[in-house]
């Protein structure tokens, strides 16, 4: 979390962003909140990035402003617009690019003054795991896909019966580039694997880490996965 | 509410240069959460987008007609232009101007649209 | 560019029955698709936004899903003013693309 004041005493006002993290080719918000006002056209919302001489986003006397926007942020940005009179200038950008990472300004004018504050914003791509038995293989065997990871993550498999045991012998991972050329799939396969265990399949990069997990029994098969997002901070 | 109404020859030479004008009323073209489009629909087929343009005169046009495109834009008359050059009779449509969202990039409201004709 | 592909070309459904309309797209648009109802001699109509965002004054019975690459519009009673051409747009990335439409027309 990081919290930006205004330069002059009295005339600042509180502005608080959210560090995130984009998925490449996805939709993402870039958050932001600050104390409101009670006109709206007194507010302003700038959004800048270091390195970029446009705008990223302007919305004053109640409505965009694109007139100075960057061309890498042509049709691609929005602010909440009903929102912003309840303290809201977080920003919606479109098909997230690898080359949207980077730190942003999200700046703020009211009649109570001004402030700012800044936002790390990572991109890259992640997506669930599925773990599947493969039943072609010559022994039990697991199957752990995910479609769209960059950078390359490690992937590291556990299981609840040998907690601690170290699997990397009995596995074997494999990246596959996607066809955009960036991203790229992740599959990893676990060999000898015994029934009455949960194994999980951990993929992680600097970005997210997911978890696959299964449950296999003689009668029944469990899945689960999640996705956590890293160093989430706030400002 | 908003309306937009194309006007422009109807009929223009190959080789020559197809210019519509697209006027606004009961609004401003000046409205900042807005581009202004052009988008063409040949006679029985589907929708191709030409390009946008913001109040301010900055454009983005579509790569495939770029290097013949040129759109501008007159606030004083809430008008927005749109000029083809070295049209051939594969440019013959119906034109369209719409009002185009900034993001979400959605085309509401149309003009009514305008045939042009290439023939010689 | 991204080529938006609609399915099938020509729907043949009864008043009151339910139509569903397909639009598939060369790779992800995320939710960034919007979908047009086009009649005979008019300018297309914005129906909805987003994928399935309603737009104001657009009734009920037209609905939006999906993401991604596979995209639905489901009208759930046709009404006779329904019978036209539908049409969805990408707005993920320029340029701009739409697919090739759909005829809705009377069985």
């Known amino acids: 979390l990081i919290i930006g004041f205004g330069i002059s005493g009295r005339h600042s006002i509180t502005v608080t962003t959210v560090a995130s993290a984009g998925n490449i080719g996805e939709d993402g918000i870039l958050s932001c909140t600050f104390e409101p006002d009670i006109k709206l056209s007194d507010i302003v919302i700038q959004w800048l990035k270091e390195g970029v001489i446009g705008l990223v986003h302007e919305f004053k006397e109640g409505k965009d402003e694109l007139s100075e926007q960057d061309e890498m942020f042509r049709g691609r940005t929005a602010v909440f617009a009903d929102q912003v009179i309840v303290g809201n200038a977080s920003l919606r950008l479109k098909n997230v690019q690898l080359t949207d990472a980077g730190t942003y300004k999200c700046y703020i004018i009211t009649s109570k003054g001004k402030g700012n504050a800044n936002l790390e914003y990572k991109t890259g791509a992640f997506s669930m795991p599925e773990v599947n038995v493969d039943y072609n293989a010559s022994s039990e065997t697991l199957r752990c896909e995910a479609p769209r990871w960059f950078p390359q993550p490690t992937v590291v498999w556990a299981s609840q019966v040998d907690q601690g045991a170290n699997f990397s012998e009995v596995s074997n991972t494999s990246f596959e580039l996607n066809s955009e050329n960036v991203t790229m799939k992740v599959v990893s396969v676990l060999y000898n694997v015994t029934i009455n265990n949960t194994y999980s399949c951990m993929i992680e990069n600097d970005i997210a880490k997911a978890t696959g997990d299964i449950k296999v029994t003689e009668s029944e098969i469990k899945r689960r996965s999640h996705l956590q997002l890293l160093n989430s901070k706030a400002s | 509410q908003l309306q937009l109404q194309e006007s422009g020859p109807g009929l223009v030479k190959p080789s020559e240069t197809l210019s519509l004008t697209c006027t606004v009323s009961?609004?401003?073209?000046?409205?900042?959460?807005?581009?202004w489009g052009w988008i063409r629909q040949p006679p029985g087929k589907g929708l191709e987008w030409i390009g946008n343009?913001?109040?301010?005169?900055?454009?983005y046009y579509n790569p495939s007609l770029k290097s013949r495109v040129t759109m501008s834009v007159d606030t004083s008359k809430n008008q927005f232009s749109l000029k083809l050059s070295s049209v051939t009779a594969a440019d013959t449509a119906v034109y369209y101007c719409?009002?185009?969202?900034?993001?979400?990039?959605?085309?509401?409201?149309w003009g009514q649209g305008t045939l042009v004709t290439v023939s010689s | 560019e991204i080529v938006m592909t609609q399915s099938p070309a020509t729907l043949s459904v009864s008043p009151g029955e339910r139509a569903t309309l397909s639009c598939r797209a060369s790779?992800?648009?995320?939710?960034?698709l919007a979908w047009y109802q086009q009649k005979p001699g008019q300018a297309p109509r914005l129906l909805i936004y987003?994928?399935?965002a309603r737009v104001t004054g657009i009734p009920a019975r037209f609905s939006g899903s999906g993401s991604g690459t596979e995209f639905t519009l489901t009208i759930s009673s046709l009404q006779s003013e329904d019978f036209a051409v539908y049409y969805c747009?990408?707005?993920?990335?320029?340029?701009?693309?739409f697919g090739g439409g759909t005829k809705v027309e009377i069985k």
């Open positions: 009961g609004g401003s073209i000046k409205s900042g959460s807005h581009y």
């Open positions: 747009q990408q707005y993920h990335s320029f340029p701009f693309t």
């Open positions: 343009i913001y109040y301010s005169g900055s454009t």
């Open positions: 790779q992800s648009v995320s939710t960034n």
């Open positions: 719409a009002r185009e969202g900034s993001y979400p990039n959605w085309f509401d409201p």
């Open positions: 987003d994928a399935s």
